[in-house]
């Protein structure tokens, strides 16, 4: 018969034949042959593989480093990675939760809508027209642009969401 060019789901093509993939939680020891099945072995302690695979090495479970404020939220299994979370009152810096911060800052152009608490991180909002923030902050709101008119000045440079307006003297040449 013709050698296959594609294999079924949960199989892989090697040496012109279809071999079974190893199930999650197991790694590949040897490919199948015409006479033998694929040989797989369970991942060791603190290792995992989360898909049907032909990997020869299992992945190490994530380490929740207490020096970074991390603790184990869910212990890993042979089929799943460990899930880390932050100590109480701290917040993950990303979905993967690789490190912790007390709270995040709002970047220039954004103001603080709500200051962080033990359970919720800082909530930022974009500075609307007429307001700006030129700093990274965990407490400062957007500031209103300076009103040049109230100082008997004119706008020399328009404000943005990150910069205040620049005021200057009135043009004295006008009648």
């Amino acid at each position: 018969p013709e050698p296959p060019t594609a294999c079924r789901e949960k199989q892989y093509l090697i040496n012109s034949q279809c071999c079974s993939l190893c199930q999650p939680g197991q790694k590949l020891v040897s490919d199948c042959t015409e006479f033998t099945e694929t040989e797989c072995l369970p991942c060791g302690e603190s290792e995992f593989l989360d898909t049907w695979n032909r990997e020869t090495h299992c992945h190490q479970h994530k380490y929740c480093d207490p020096n970074l404020g991390l603790r184990v939220q869910q212990k890993g299994t042979s089929e799943t990675d460990t899930i880390c979370t932050c100590e109480e009152g701290w917040h993950c810096t990303s979905e993967a939760c690789e490190s912790c911060v007390l709270h995040r800052s709002c970047s220039p152009g954004f103001g603080v809508k709500q200051i962080a608490t033990g359970v919720s991180d800082t909530i930022c909002e974009p500075c609307p027209v007429g307001f700006f923030s030129n700093v990274s902050s965990a407490f400062e709101k957007c500031h209103p642009w300076t009103s040049c008119e109230t100082k008997d000045l004119v706008v020399q440079q328009a404000g943005t969401n990150k910069t205040d307006v620049v005021c200057g003297p009135q043009d004295r040449l006008r009648a």
């Epitope: 701290w90 800052s105 990274s136 902050s137």
Partner: nanobody, 116 residues
Framework: EVQLLESGGGLVQPGGSLRLSCAAS???????EMWWVRQAPGKGLERVS?????????YYADSVKGRFTISRDDSKNTLYLQMNSLRAEDTAVYYC?????????WGQGTLVTVSS
């Protein structure tokens, strides 16, 4: 290496005052927003007060407004918290924190005990 060293805590009677200091090293202190945070025994972290990098803006939690004053001396790389009219509920370990507020920048804190 960034280091924040808090000091000035101690035992004080209700109604008394204390001034906490936070000596910063390993980074350019000027221009960084700074916070005071506290943790009472068996409780979570509470954000007490903050000061902008320029020193021009401050924040106080409602629980300390009118009693505590945050300040900074950029020439001494030091953050301060003046605490007046202290109450039993102010008993906590007080920490200072700098942006980006990473756990590994966390100091040891200084213990404030308000008791008669």
């Amino acid at each position: 290496e960034v280091q924040l060293l808090e000091s000035g805590g101690g035992l004080v009677q209700p109604g008394g005052s204390l001034r906490l200091s936070c000596a910063a090293s390993g980074f350019t202190f000027a221009g960084y927003e700074m916070w005071w945070v506290r943790q009472a025994p068996g409780k979570g972290l509470e954000r007490v007060s903050a000061i902008s990098g320029s020193g021009g803006s401050t924040y106080y939690a409602d629980s300390v407004k009118g009693r505590f004053t945050i300040s900074r001396d950029d020439s001494k790389n030091t953050l301060y918290l003046q605490m007046n009219s202290l109450r039993a509920e102010d008993t906590a370990v007080y920490y200072c924190a700098k942006e980006p507020y990473s756990y590994d920048y966390w100091g040891q804190g200084t213990l404030v005990t308000v008791s008669s």
